[in-house]
């Protein structure tokens, strides 16, 4: 068994998945609390199956071919909090099978063949918080009379056959407050008026319902924080009309998702009943534009318009959403043009995500981002080339995070496009094809903490003594992986005294570059996948003063020429990450052997 179950945390957490086991191995300690036991073979479970493991708090029995759960199966498991029975073809659950775990909070009965809620022995589940019943054959949500709904927070019925919901059905859930109720994929065809007006919901999900009129009519007088009415590509559903959305006037909703639907008509009054709405997700709703002067969206704080068909940013008619703080337009189907001042009316905007849009701009981004003076997060990653002038982001002086990853940048040297960003903390420049010889590139970033330069190459593969990093003395995290580096000057990082995380992986560095880290202490240092073979004794103190080091995937020498390092390695195993992949390359007889297993005797 020692070769089989994996110990994740001594005496506490074990993974015994997919081992063909038909009982609990004797060598599993009694103190086990967290057990992953899925994909084994337990056709019948009873009061002796797990009786030894009285400390269990989490038990995953997914797809163990369980048919029968007998009386008092979990009688001694008072601490059991999560029980996962997903994917077991249950024929019988004894009335007392769940009597022991008084603190059971999360019960998963997904894909267990249940067709009637009477099947579940519920009377002891006073503390149940979430019940997952997806992918079964349930047609009525009528629970037994004694169903304890008081603490219930999540009730998931997705992908069942619930076509009608009555007031009577919902009465058993009246005690639940802030319940998240999921009917996704049920093709609900009718809701009795008033069924949902007896309690306040955290979220209601009717995703994939072909006829939304049924939902809007049935939810009159209801209150929910979030209403998910999205659909899916393969569902043939009715277009949303303005008239249909009038149903929202009779309910209280803060967050609404309509993804993948089509609108038959969008006019200035389409969203007039959305006056209380704070979040609206219109992902993939085939929109080409939104009309100006739309009523009802004054309080909207978050808007998602991803995967649509806009030609230009002005077509979203941003003036409709004066209170907006978060705007996401990702993966537009067409090449998206930023236009001039298209978002200028969004003076409260804090987060703007324009990634994956094929955006191209020769003079970015002052005119395009005009008046976004409160913007804190800007994502322009995965776009086409952007030309950045000096102070390209001067309209966004409050920026704290700027993500330009995988967007080729054309920078007007020798100035810095970032020089007015006095609050910028995170800058992602992964694979931006930067001219790293421009020493002013990062000037004017006094509080930059996290800099990702992955995939940007340095001239001659060298970071010299004078380099673009000297202006960012506040850096704590520096990522220089895959930068084609061959060497780093001993003084290259001398102005970076605050660093706690340095990633130099996937380069071609030799041990000489370790000298550049001599002034740093207690850092996480990733040197994986470089060209390090022998590490001389004089460099070992530099490694010793760091907290975690990764030297995996280097062509390490395991001969007596490297004995000082090999000895140091074994003494410092607690500091080393990736030791399974830290192997010898030389001599040929030891190639592939883990460093920790090497035993050398050197005269």
């Amino acid at each position: 068994w020692d070769q089989m179950c994996i110990e994740k945390e001594a005496n506490k957490t074990y993974n015994c998945e997919n081992l063909g086991l038909s009982e609990i191995p004797d060598t599993l300690p009694n103190t086990t609390e967290f057990l992953e036991f899925s994909f084994n073979f337990l056709p019948t479970i009873h009061n002796r199956t797990f009786s030894r493991l009285m400390n269990l708090t989490f038990l995953d029995l997914t797809r163990c071919q369980i048919n029968w759960i007998h009386e008092d199966t979990f009688q001694s498991h008072h601490q059991l909090s999560t029980l996962v029975l997903t994917g077991n073809p249950l024929i019988f659950m004894a009335e007392t099978s769940l009597n022991g775990p008084k603190s059971l909070k999360h019960l998963f009965l997904i894909q267990t063949g249940i067709s009637n809620l009477e099947f579940i022995p519920v009377h002891n589940l006073e503390n149940l918080e979430s019940l997952y019943l997806g992918s079964n054959h349930i047609s009525s949500i009528k629970f037994p009379k004694d169903f304890p709904a008081r603490n219930l927070k999540v009730l998931d019925f997705q992908n069942n056959a619930i076509h009608y919901i009555s007031r009577e059905d919902m009465r058993s859930l009246e005690q639940a407050i802030n319940l998240s109720l999921n009917f996704n994929g049920n093709n609900v065809k009718g809701i009795e008026l008033g069924a949902f007006d007896s309690t306040i919901f955290q979220s209601l999900n009717f995703g994939g319902t072909p006829n939304l009129s049924v939902i809007f009519n049935g939810l009159q007088n209801s209150t929910t924080q979030s209403l998910w009415l999205g659909t899916f590509e393969d569902i043939d559903d009715e277009d949303i009309s303005s008239a249909m959305l009038k149903g929202l006037c009779e309910m209280s909703v803060e967050s609404l998702n309509l993804q993948e639907h089509r609108f038959s008509d969008i006019s200035s009054t389409t969203f007039q009943c959305f006056t209380q709405l704070q979040e609206l997700d219109l992902t993939a709703t085939h929109l080409k534009g939104l009309p100006s002067g739309m009523k009802g969206l004054n309080l909207l704080k978050k808007l998602v318009l991803s995967v649509n068909h806009f030609d230009q940013l002005c077509q979203i008619s941003a003036a409709n959403f004066p209170s907006l703080t978060h705007l996401y337009i990702r993966g537009n189907v067409k090449k998206l043009h930023l236009g001039v001042g298209c978002l200028e009316k969004l003076g409260n905007l804090q987060t703007l995500d324009l990634s994956h849009n094929d955006i191209e701009a020769s003079d970015c981004c002052s005119l395009q981002l005009k008046n976004l003076s409160h913007l804190q997060t800007l994502n322009l990653s995965h776009n086409e080339p952007l030309g950045l002038q000096s102070q390209a982001f001067k309209e966004c002086p409050q920026l704290e995070l700027l993500d330009l990853a995988f967007t080729r940048l054309h920078i007007n040297a020798p100035q810095s496009p970032f020089q007015n960003l006095h609050f910028l903390q995170v800058l992602n420049l992964t694979y931006c094809f930067l001219d790293t010889s421009n020493q002013h590139l990062l000037a004017g970033l006094p509080v930059l903490r996290h800099l990702n330069l992955k995939g940007n190459h340095f001239q001659d593969g060298t970071i010299t003594k004078t380099n673009l990093l000297q202006t960012v003395g506040s850096l704590e995290v520096l990522i220089l992986s895959s930068c084609g580096l061959l060497s780093i000057d001993q003084q290259a990082f001398h102005s970076l005294g605050k660093m706690s995380h340095v990633d130099l992986s996937h380069n071609s560095l030799t041990c000489d570059s370790i000298d550049s880290l001599s002034h740093l202490k207690g850092i996480y240092l990733n040197l994986a996948a470089n060209s390090i073979n022998i590490i001389s004794p004089r460099l070992l103190p530099i490694l010793s003063q760091q907290s975690t080091i990764n030297l995996s995937h280097n062509p390490l020498d395991c001969t007596c020429s490297n004995i000082h390092f090999l000895t140091w390695y074994k003494e410092n195993l607690h500091k080393l990450e990736g030791s399974e992949e830290t192997t010898c390359a030389n001599p040929p007889s030891l190639r592939g052997v883990k460093l920790s297993d090497v035993k050398l005797s050197c005269g």
């Epitope: 030609d311 230009q312 002005c314 077509q315 003036a319 043009h337 930023l338 236009g339 001039v340 001042g341 298209c342 200028e344 009316k345 191209e360 701009a361 020769s362 003079d363 005119l367 395009q368 005009k370 080339p385 030309g387 002038q389 054309h410 007007n412 040297a413």
Partner: antibody, heavy 118, light 107 residues
Amino acid sequence: EVQLQQSGPELVKPGASMKISCKASGYSFTGYTMNWVKQSHGKTLEWIGLINPYNGVTSYNQKFKDKATLTVDKSSSTAYMELLSLTSEDSAIYYCARDYNYDYFDYWGQGTTLTVSS
Amino acid sequence: DIQMTQSPASLSASVGETVTITCRASEKIYSYLAWYQQKQGKSPQLLVYNAKTLAEGVPSRFSVSGSGTQFSLRINSLQPEDFGTYYCQHHFGSPRTFGGGTKLEIK
């Protein structure tokens, strides 16, 4: 067919102001920014500034910041440039020109000749 | 401001000849360059954008090269309708500026 039709030639006295118009047709007027370009006699072209007809946002060449004022009338798909405090230096042909992504000019008006003379 | 310098300022050539006009930017402008042709008494017309792409309807005898600071426009087998003045223009930052123009005349 995209067309930019400019107003006719003007003769004005020094110190006066005048307004040139540019009527757009054949495309969505609010979907493209409108630029103005000056060509002095026998000289090169100079970019004056631009306006986004959708929202009225403008950007000027610093050199013309106090000389030109750009406006639009969406209802008639017309862009205007008003030139202030005219001197003989302002005598030139003025063009309106459309661009889509704040870059190059794909369609030009026929030009308006302005002569400033007492 | 970025200065654009064109050369030559003027040249004479015969129908059927090949000519080359060059444009130099005072700073690196990558491929953010357009070329225009202007005939006497007419407005300019877009010939080339993004330094390399011929505008719609421009004949293939026009070819372009260059990026960074040095660009050229070459016209093979000159036709009578090719005579006029040619301008380059950058769109890398504001203000967008034009070259001084190259006047191409019939010899």
